[in-house]
């Protein structure tokens, strides 16, 4: 199982470049000891990234504003774009050096050249998900899961900002599926493809799953999907009654799962 705020449930690869990807603990940011970070990377078939591997990834655009363990007990994070709130206005690997106390808690930077997945688990109040490589065309044979996990009682408002997937009548080749639940088994809402923007979706509970799959043939422009938190008191928390339009399969029912 896998995610950003939880290392494994369902699908687990996060921001990734040159085989390097970032991991957080199940409980959130800065909660992995060195031993745990090492174990997480190794369990997933990789290992802690070296400084050189992290720098190579940074040079092709890997930018994460979170300090993480690297090989040999080193801690740092890759900055591509300087900003006042991250990296002290610098670019490069922000290097905290080799830590004497391996019980300190940071995130992890793993290296696995065979990693081909994307997605994660997200507890942020709002976020934009992009198809891998967006705004460039996505690759063949992609499977990505984004698991949204908000506080109990909150709901999720999903909106489609950009949408361009291979079109076929049954959305069998490339598609995005939305589930009104933690996983991609329960609470199926709809399957979407083509280039029409699907209507907004509001969850019934505090969790939602997005699945993106591309087959081994035609690719297209990809997508950007945004979510924001709807608090219980908010008047906008009534889900829209959406109907079947464009190239999407939609189940009008809503399912409460967590």
């Amino acid at each position: 199982w896998g995610f950003k705020n939880g290392i494994f449930h369902n699908s687990i690869w996060l921001e990734q470049a040159a085989g390097v990807y970032h991991r957080e603990a199940r409980a959130g940011r800065y909660k992995l000891t060195y031993a745990e970070a090492k174990a997480v990377c190794e369990f997933e078939g990789g290992r802690l990234a070296t400084y050189k591997q992290l720098e190579a990834a940074r040079k092709i655009g890997f930018h994460v504003c979170a300090a993480g363990w690297m090989a040999k007990g080193r801690v740092g994070y890759p900055i591509v774009k300087p900003g006042p709130n991250c990296g002290f206005g610098k670019t490069g690997i922000i290097d905290y050096g080799i830590r004497l106390n391996r019980s300190e808690r940071w995130d992890a930077y793993c290296y696995n050249p065979h990693a081909k997945e994307c997605g994660g688990v997200f507890t942020d109040p709002k976020r934009i998900f992009k198809s891998p490589g967006f705004p460039n065309e996505y690759d063949d044979n992609q499977v990505c899961y984004w698991h949204i996990r908000l506080k109990y009682g909150q709901r999720i408002h999903l909106s489609f900002l950009d949408f361009d997937l291979e079109h076929d009548p049954g959305c069998l080749a490339d598609y995005v599926e939305i589930y009104d639940s933690y996983d991609d088994v329960h609470g199926f809402v709809g399957r979407y493809c083509g280039d029409e923007l699907p209507e907004d979706i509001i969850s019934t509970g505090n969790v939602m799953t997005l699945k993106f799959l591309s087959d081994a043939s035609v690719t297209a422009g990809g997508f950007q999907i945004k979510y924001v938190t709807v608090d219980p008191a908010s008047k906008s928390s009534q889900a829209k009654n959406t109907s079947t339009t464009g190239n999407k399969k939609f189940l009008p029912g809503r399912f409460s799962h967590l």
Epitope: G2, G6, R26, K31, L150, Y152
Partner: antibody
């Protein structure tokens, strides 16, 4: 040393509520998910839910929604499970367990026995 | 929910014998991202909480004797004890750690003759 110290045995009447506690080391409390698992006498294990005290996220087994409520008190590094509208079906041993950052429970409390009797 | 089914429900063997128990899940526990199975095995002795034996279907937890071996993938898993010892008297549970709600099998009760 990771320790999950659970409250002692409880005797409650049908229809009443009870609150079980699980005290963790500060490190465990803040950095992991704390889970609750039910085991009736001679029966198997049932997962009730998981709470992340660091961010307040809580996830329930649908079966226990309305029956169990998980809360956490940061000041005492203690997680609580309240069970309401008790019936004989709720009589069981309840374990709290820490979920590792890998896919398993790596530390368990000793269990709290709940007896429901009039 | 993912349903975990264990068999047999009980076993009675003599010390030194090899034991195999099965666990089947109603859905695949294979994570497509890292090709790992999110299945764990626990041992529970009378009056004690469960103790982890195996995770990821086949990785032995530190300190667990080598006679315990986990195998399988997808929906079919097996726990093997190569040479049962008297101290292995316990109930053995498999657990889905792939997705919420976490679910356990009904258990296999191992008795020593």
């Amino acid at each position: 040393q990771v320790q999950l110290q659970q409250s002692g045995a409880e005797l409650a009447r049908p229809g009443a509520s009870v609150k079980l506690s699980c005290k963790a080391s500060d490190d465990t409390f803040i950095n992991y998910g704390i889970n609750w698992v039910k085991q009736r006498t001679g029966q198997g294990l049932e997962w009730i839910g998981e709470t992340f005290p660091s961010n307040g996220n809580t996830f329930y087994n649908e079966k226990f929604k309305g029956k169990a409520t998980l809360t956490a008190d940061r000041s005492s590094s203690t997680t609580y499970m309240e069970l309401r509208s008790l019936t004989s079906e709720d009589a069981a041993v309840y374990f709290c367990a820490r979920h590792s950052n890998l896919p398993y429970f790596d530390h368990w409390g000793q269990g709290s026995t709940l007896t429901v009797s009039s | 929910d993912i349903v975990m089914t264990q068999s047999p429900s009980s076993l009675s063997v003599s010390a030194g014998e090899k034991v195999t128990m099965s666990c089947k899940s109603s859905q695949s526990l294979l994570n497509s991202g890292n090709q790992k199975n999110y299945l764990a095995w626990y041992q529970q002795k009378p009056g004690q909480p469960p103790k982890l034996l195996i995770y990821g279907a086949s990785t032995r937890e530190s300190g667990v004797p080598e006679r315990f071996t986990g195998s399988g993938s997808g929906t079919d898993f097996t726990l093997t004890i190569s040479s049962v010892q008297a101290e292995d008297l316990a109930v053995y549970y498999c657990q889905n750690d792939h997705s919420y709600p976490f679910t356990f099998g009904g258990g296999t009760n191992l008795e020593i003759k």
